[in-house]
């Protein structure tokens, strides 16, 4: 019995279906086929879970969180024991193993391994200003999304004709911050943060209004 090499890893957007491949060759008839799909979740590597099982002509469900979402892609028994997972969740990310037994065919590689990564587009980021908006001050524009896999990068731009940040601004696209030093009236305006990753983008807006000093009355 020999389980074929798998593609290594599969990426899928959250909510979309995933197909985890597992095919094998065997010298024996498929009358005593046993298949177990297991997952070692990324979120809990110490707790492997059963996904779906086939034994003695019957299908058995695995962990309750997979109920109604998982099945074999074809009619069993077969040498293609790939499974589908519908409505993929973030918690489905992990390392999946198909373990195949088909007595009396023993020996060879009876395990196939496929990684599944469920990708999540950035959630609507939260924009905020840190620091005084008085002229001459330094301010930091902050942007962060609660969700996003892979981790989003953040691009700040000023919504004017140039889309360029002020010359005194420095940007950290990983942290999602822009530091603008010595703000002036020219620093005022709408700023947009674009959070993006491999499968999506999301934005937020921030209105920076630099406060000019009030003229003082001399009595």
């Amino acid at each position: 019995l020999e389980v074929s090499e798998s593609p290594g890893s599969i990426q899928v957007a959250r909510g979309q279906p995933a197909v985890l491949p597992c095919t094998f060759t065997t010298s024996a008839a498929l009358i005593n086929l046993n298949v177990i799909w297991m997952v070692t979740p990324l979120s809990n590597a110490n707790q492997p879970e059963q996904v779906i099982l086939y034994q003695g002509g019957q299908m058995f469900d695995g962990a309750p969180r997979f109920h109604g979402r998982v099945g074999f892609t074809g009619t069993m028994p077969a040498t293609n024991v790939s499974i589908f997972i519908n409505n993929t969740q973030l918690s489905d990310t992990g390392t999946y193993q198909c373990l195949v037994n088909n007595l009396p065919d023993i020996g060879g590689r009876n395990i196939g391994v496929t990684g599944l990564t469920v990708l999540v587009p950035p959630s609507a980021p939260h924009c905020q200003i840190q620091g005084s908006q008085d002229i001459g001050s330094d301010v930091i524009l902050l942007c962060s999304s609660e969700e996003g896999i892979p981790r989003p990068t953040y691009l700040w731009e000023k919504l004017d004709n140039t889309l360029k940040l002020p010359p005194t601004a420095t940007q950290d696209q990983v942290q999602g911050t822009v530091t603008i030093r010595n703000i002036s009236a020219l620093s005022s305006g709408l700023y947009q943060c674009v959070a993006s990753n491999a499968i999506g983008t999301s934005t937020c807006l921030l209105d920076l209004q630099v406060i000019s000093p009030q003229p003082r009355n001399i009595g």
Epitope: I31, N32, N34, I36, Q50, L53, Q55, G56, G57, Q58, M59, F60, D61, A63, P64, H67, G68, G71, L99, N101, L103, P104
Partner: antibody
């Protein structure tokens, strides 16, 4: 304590219907496949039907196919067997039985927990 | 469906005797064989699974062996509480089937 308690048995005329229930306690019902197994008076055991934990997969013995329907309600920890078009040969004690999958020979399935049974008599 | 033939259908034995019960399958079932004990008016109880593995809590005087089509349940030293009917059952394929039983009676 792990327990299965059947109810709903009784006397019914040929062609009649009956619904058996099984109340489970002491284990996570929603994680296990469940079965009905019957035993005619003075006879051996006969597997009747199986249902997987999520109700995705259902199996019947040829002798009851098209007449019996197995179902479950995981929220109520309950297993059911709706029996229609009953015949005299359906007379038996009906057991509610849990299946477990054990890691042996790859995997194998076993009837590990049995209820006390409920008697169904089909007679005119 | 796979047929399981148990022999003998009944036997008489004394406390302390060694008892063996045979179960023959109509085709190779690759050790997917389980044994159950049933006392009068009671539900069956799992003794042995996968041909030779002892279920938790079952006394070690019970053992199972066999391969392919031929399987055996052995009680090394019969105790008073062992007088009962014993069934073999295969989980190799659907439908799951049982043998007709072997009744162990007091001599």
């Amino acid at each position: 304590e792990v327990q299965l308690v059947e109810s709903g048995g009784g006397l019914v005329k040929p062609g009649g219907s009956l619904r058996l229930s099984c109340a489970a306690s002491g284990f996570t019902f929603s994680s296990y496949s469940m079965n009905w197994v019957r035993q005619a008076p003075g006879k051996g055991l006969e597997w009747v039907s199986s249902i997987s934990s999520s109700s995705s997969y259902i199996y019947y013995a040829d002798s009851v196919k098209g007449r019996f329907t197995i179902s479950r309600d995981n929220a109520k920890n309950s297993l059911y067997l709706q029996m229609n078009s009953l015949r005299a040969e359906d007379t038996a004690v009906y057991y509610c039985v849990r299946s477990i999958i054990v890691q042996a020979l790859g995997i194998t399935s076993v009837f590990d927990i049995w209820g006390q049974g409920t008697m169904v008599t089909v007679s005119s | 469906a796979i047929r399981l033939t148990q022999s003998p259908s009944s036997l008489s034995a004394s406390v302390g005797d060694r008892v063996t019960i045979s179960c023959r399958a109509s085709q190779i079932i690759s050790n997917h064989l389980n044994w159950y004990q049933q006392k009068p008016g009671k539900a069956p109880k799992l003794l042995i699974y996968a041909a030779s593995r002892l279920q938790t809590g079952v006394p070690s005087r019970f053992s199972g062996s066999g391969s392919e089509t031929d399987y055996t349940l052995t009680i090394s030293s019969l105790q008073p509480e062992d007088f009962a009917t014993y069934y073999c059952q295969q989980s190799y394929s659907n439908p799951r089937t049982f043998g007709h039983g072997t009744k162990v009676e007091i001599k």
